[in-house]
C-alpha cells in the first residue's frame, strides 16, 4: 500500500506521520522550594520533581535547573497549577487600620526562554487579588494553553511569592507540557 | 514504500501508528446527585451523565458506577470542573460572633483506583478556602493534567461536599479524559 | 510493509492516519474591545487577535468576526481564560448600606453556533460571585474541555460584562482550540 492511502484524500501529507507514544511529554510536581536569589523585578522560578511519584519526563523532554527543555519544534499544550496559601492578607489589616486598601495578589506566570533572545516571553499569566476575611486562606491558580515552540526553548513557572506556594502535595501544584 | 518513510528520520518507530479518531475519549457532564454512603474520611464521588447532551464516551472508554474505565495503557489528559454554590459560609458567621475565623473550604480531587492496589491515588486536587461576604456565593474549580495510566485503571471525581455541587447545567460541572 | 503493520493488532484502522502538524489549531489573544450592540439577555462576545504576538491560526482553522471556524469534523479540545478586573463590587457597597447583599458575578461562556440553527449551544461556563472587600480586584476564570464538533461550527467566547475584561496582556486573556 502506498503511504498516501493513510492520509485523508483532501490533503497532502506535508508533515511526517509519527507514533503518539514517541512524543515529548512531561508532568512535573511540586517540591519544597529553597530560597534563591532573583532579580528585583522578576518573579522567582519554581523548581520541580521530575521523576518521583506522578512526575515524569519522556521522549527527550528533559528537566534541568527549573527549566523544561523543548527537544523538538512543534505545537505544545502547556499547563500548570499552583496552590497558594497564607495568613490574612495585608489588605484586610491595612483596611482595619484605615489606610487605602490596595489588595495583595498572587500570580503565576509560565515563561519561555530562548537562548538567542535575551528577554523571556510570558506565555500564560494567572493573577488574582487576595483580600481574604478569614485568617487562613488557600486557593489554586490554573493555566493551560497551546503554543508553537522551537527546539531549544526552555519553559519555567514563576510566582509572585515563593513562600506562599503550597508544596505539601504533588496533586496541588504541578507543571506539564506535551507535544500535540 | 517502507514504513520507515512515515517516521521522522531521527527516531525508531517503537510504538504503532494509530488513527486519532480511534483513541479512547470521554466527556461526562453533571447530573443531580443521589445521596450515597461514603467513608468518614473519604470525599464522596460524583456520578455523571455519559451519553445525553454534550456527554460522550467512545473507543472503549466506558463509564460505569461513578468511574471512567481506562481501556488502554498510555498517557491521558484528564480534566474536570466543578462549580460549587452555597449560602454564606460559617466563616463569616463565626467572625461576626468573635470566634476564631477558620475558613470553610471547597475541594475537588481526581482520583485513580487500581484494582491491584488498595489505596486510591490522588492525581489532581483543587482546594479553596471559602470565606465569602455575600449571602450567596458560587465559583468553579478547574483541574487538568497529563498522567500515565494503565489498562484497567479507574478514574473518579471526589468533592468535599456533594450538596454544594451545582448540577443545574452541563457546562458548569464536567469531567473528561482522552488518550494523547 | 503492509500498512496494517502500523496499526495495533486489536483494531481496524477505520479512520485515516494523518500528520499531527496538519491538524486545525488556533490560539487567540485578547485585544481592546470595541463596545458593540448585543441582545439584552445575551452576553457579548469578545473579539480576538489571531496573528500577532503569541496568536496564530493554522491548517484551515480560521478566525473571523469574533468566531473560530471549525474546518473539519472531529473531537477538539477548547479552552479559554478571561481575566476580569474591577473596582469594589456593588455587593460590598450594598452591604455597608445595610441592604440585602446580593453578590455581583463574573461569567465566561464558550459557545458553539451552527449555521443551520439560530440558537447557540453553551459548551463551557465558568461563573463566580464577586463580593470583594478590597477596592480593586482582579481574577481569572479558566475553562477547557473536549467536544465533538462538525465542520462549519463556529466558536465564540461570551462574557457577562465586557468592560471588566483585562485586555492589557496577551497572556492574561486568551482562547484556543485544537483538533485531537
Amino acid at each position: 500500500l502506498k503511504g498516501q492511502e493513510f492520509a485523508p484524500s483532501h490533503q497532502q501529507v506535508y508533515a511526517p506521520l509519527r507514533a503518539d507514544g514517541d512524543k515529548p511529554r512531561a508532568h512535573l510536581t511540586v517540591v519544597r522550594q529553597t530560597p534563591t536569589q532573583h532579580f528585583k523585578n522578576q518573579f522567582p522560578a519554581l523548581h520541580w520533581e521530575h521523576e518521583l511519584g506522578l512526575a515524569f519526563t519522556k521522549n527527550r523532554m528533559n528537566y534541568t535547573n527549573k527549566f523544561l527543555l523543548i527537544p523538538e519544534s512543534g505545537d505544545y499544550f502547556i499547563y500548570s497549577q499552583v496552590t497558594f496559601r497564607g495568613m490574612t492578607s495585608e489588605c484586610s489589616e491595612i483596611r482595619q487600620a484605615g489606610r487605602p486598601n490596595k489588595p495583595d495578589s498572587i500570580t503565576v506566570v509560565i515563561t519561555k526562554v530562548t537562548d538567542s533572545y535575551p528577554e523571556p516571553t510570558q506565555l500564560l499569566m494567572g493573577t488574582k487579588s487576595v483580600c481574604e476575611v478569614g485568617s487562613n486562606w488557600f486557593q489554586p491558580i490554573y493555566l493551560g494553553a497551546m503554543f508553537s515552540l522551537q527546539e531549544g526553548d526552555k519553559l519555567m513557572v514563576n510566582v509572585s511569592d515563593i513562600s506562599l506556594v503550597d508544596y505539601t502535595k504533588e496533586d496541588k501544584t504541578f507543571f506539564g507540557a506535551f507535544l500535540l | 514504500l517502507k514504513g520507515q518513510e512515515f517516521a521522522p528520520s531521527h527516531q525508531q518507530v517503537y510504538a504503532p501508528l494509530r488513527a486519532d479518531g480511534d483513541k479512547p475519549r470521554a466527556h461526562l457532564t453533571v447530573v443531580r446527585q443521589t445521596p450515597t454512603q461514603h467513608f468518614k474520611n473519604q470525599f464522596p464521588a460524583l456520578h455523571w451523565e455519559h451519553e445525553l447532551g454534550l456527554a460522550f464516551t467512545k473507543n472503549r472508554m466506558n463509564y460505569t458506577n461513578k468511574f471512567l474505565l481506562i481501556p488502554e495503557s498510555g498517557d491521558y489528559f484528564i480534566y474536570s470542573q466543578v462549580t460549587f454554590r452555597g449560602m454564606t459560609s460559617e466563616c463569616s458567621e463565626i467572625r461576626q460572633a468573635g470566634r476564631p475565623n477558620k475558613p470553610d473550604s471547597i475541594t475537588v480531587v481526581i482520583t485513580k483506583v487500581t484494582d491491584s492496589y488498595p489505596e486510591p491515588t490522588q492525581l489532581l486536587m483543587g482546594t479553596k478556602s471559602v470565606c465569602e461576604v455575600g449571602s450567596n456565593w458560587f465559583q468553579p474549580i478547574y483541574l487538568g493534567a497529563m498522567f500515565s495510566l494503565q489498562e484497567g485503571d479507574k478514574l473518579m471525581v471526589n468533592v468535599s461536599d456533594i450538596s454544594l455541587v451545582d448540577y443545574t447545567k452541563e457546562d458548569k460541572t464536567f469531567f473528561g479524559a482522552f488518550l494523547l | 510493509l503492509k500498512g496494517q503493520e502500523f496499526a495495533p493488532s486489536h483494531q481496524q484502522v477505520y479512520a485515516p492516519l494523518r500528520a499531527d502538524g496538519d491538524k486545525p489549531r488556533a490560539h487567540l489573544t485578547v485585544v481592546r474591545q470595541t463596545p458593540t450592540q448585543h441582545f439584552k439577555n445575551q452576553f457579548p462576545a469578545l473579539h480576538w487577535e489571531h496573528e500577532l504576538g503569541l496568536a496564530f491560526t493554522k491548517n484551515r482553522m480560521n478566525y473571523t468576526n469574533k468566531f473560530l471556524l471549525i474546518p473539519e469534523s472531529g473531537d477538539y479540545f477548547i479552552y479559554s481564560q478571561v481575566t476580569f478586573r474591577g473596582m469594589t463590587s456593588e455587593c460590598s457597597e450594598i452591604r455597608q448600606a445595610g441592604r440585602p447583599n446580593k453578590p455581583d458575578s463574573i461569567t465566561v461562556v464558550i459557545t458553539k453556533v451552527t449555521d443551520s440553527y439560530p440558537e447557540p449551544t453553551q459548551l463551557l461556563m465558568g461563573t463566580k460571585s464577586v463580593c470583594e472587600v478590597g477596592s480593586n480586584w482582579f481574577q481569572p476564570i479558566y475553562l477547557g474541555a473536549m467536544f465533538s464538533l462538525q465542520e462549519g461550527d463556529k466558536l465564540m467566547v461570551n462574557v457577562s460584562d465586557i468592560s471588566l475584561v483585562d485586555y492589557t496582556k496577551e497572556d492574561k486573556t486568551f482562547f484556543g482550540a485544537f483538533l485531537l
Epitope: - | 443531580r32 451519553e51 454534550l54 460522550f56 467512545k58 | 440558537e119 449551544t121 462538525q150
Partner: antibody, heavy 124, light 107 residues
Framework: QVQLVQSGAEVKKPGASVKVSCKAS????????ISWVRQAPGQGLEWMGW????????HYAQKLQGRVTMTTDTSTRTAYMELRSLRSDDTAVYYC?????????????????WGQGTTVTVSS | EIVLTQSPATLSLSPGERATLSCRAS??????LAWYQQKPGQAPRLLIY???NRATGIPARFSGSGSGTDFTLTISSLEPEDFAVYYC?????????FGQGTKVEIK
C-alpha cells in the same frame, strides 16, 4: 421552525428489510438524541431505540436487538432506522422523535418533536 | 426492563370534570417520567416532562406529580379537545418504556 420529516409509506414482504429516514430542521441536530417509536394498528406506543447524533451511541429495545440498526448522517441532518427480517407483526406506524435534553443534570426532558409517521406494511 | 402500569385503562368523564390518571413503575424512576397525549391519526404530543414540568405550549390545566414509583397526571377541568389517549414513559434507565395507555373518553 423545528421539525422532523419522515420518508413515505412502505410495503414489504416478510423477510425483507425497511429503512425509514427522518430529516431534521430548525435545531442543532447533533445535540439532541433521536428515538424511534412504533404503533401497531389499534395498539399502544412501543419504544424501539435511541441514537445520539453527537456521539453515535445507541440503545435498542430488547425484543428488537439484532434486527434493528439506527444511524445518523450529521452532514444531511438525517436519522435512519433499518429493520431487518420483517414479520407481519412489524406492521405499524413508525415515528422518529427528538429527545429534548435541557443541558441540566436536574432534567431528562421528553420527546418534544415528532415526525409525521411512516406506515410500514408487511404482507406476503 | 422497567414496566409501567397505567390505570384506569379507560376513564369516562364529561367536559369540565377533573381527570386523574395514574402511572406506576415496577421500580423507582426518580422523577424521570414524561406524559404524552395522542389523538387518532396524529403523532403523540409531549405534555409533561420530569414528572411535573409542563412542556412548551401546554395549558395550565395539565399538571403532573409524583416521584419514585407512583405518578399522577391531572387535568383540572376537561376541555373537549382533551379527550384522547394518554401515555406515561420512563426515562430513568434503558430501555425507555411506555405504559399501555389510558383512554379518556366523553361520558
Amino acid at each position: 421552525q423545528v421539525q422532523l420529516v419522515q420518508s413515505g409509506a412502505e410495503v414489504k414482504k416478510p423477510g425483507a428489510s425497511v429503512k425509514v429516514s427522518c430529516k431534521a430542521s430548525g435545531y442543532d441536530f447533533t445535540y439532541y438524541g433521536i428515538s424511534w417509536v412504533r404503533q401497531a394498528p389499534g395498539q399502544g406506543l412501543e419504544w424501539m431505540g435511541w441514537i445520539s447524533p453527537y456521539n453515535g451511541n445507541t440503545h435498542y429495545a430488547q425484543k428488537l436487538q439484532g434486527r434493528v440498526t439506527m444511524t445518523t448522517d450529521t452532514s444531511t441532518r438525517t436519522a435512519y432506522m433499518e429493520l431487518r427480517s420483517l414479520r407481519s407483526d412489524d406492521t405499524a406506524v413508525y415515528y422518529c422523535a427528538r429527545e429534548n435534553y435541557y443541558g441540566s443534570g436536574a432534567y431528562r426532558g421528553g420527546m418534544d418533536v415528532w415526525g409525521q409517521g411512516t406506515t410500514v406494511t408487511v404482507s406476503s | 426492563e422497567i414496566v409501567l402500569t397505567q390505570s384506569p385503562a379507560t376513564l369516562s368523564l364529561s367536559p369540565g370534570e377533573r381527570a386523574t390518571l395514574s402511572c406506576r413503575a415496577s421500580q423507582s424512576v426518580s422523577s424521570y417520567l414524561a406524559w404524552y397525549q395522542q389523538k387518532p391519526g396524529q403523532a403523540p404530543r409531549l405534555l409533561i416532562y420530569d414528572a411535573s414540568n409542563r412542556a412548551t405550549g401546554i395549558p395550565a390545566r395539565f399538571s403532573g406529580s409524583g416521584s419514585g414509583t407512583d405518578f399522577t397526571l391531572t387535568i383540572s377541568s376537561l376541555e373537549p379537545e382533551d379527550f384522547a389517549v394518554y401515555y406515561c414513559q420512563q426515562r430513568s434507565s434503558w430501555p425507555w418504556t411506555f405504559g399501555q395507555g389510558t383512554k379518556v373518553e366523553i361520558k
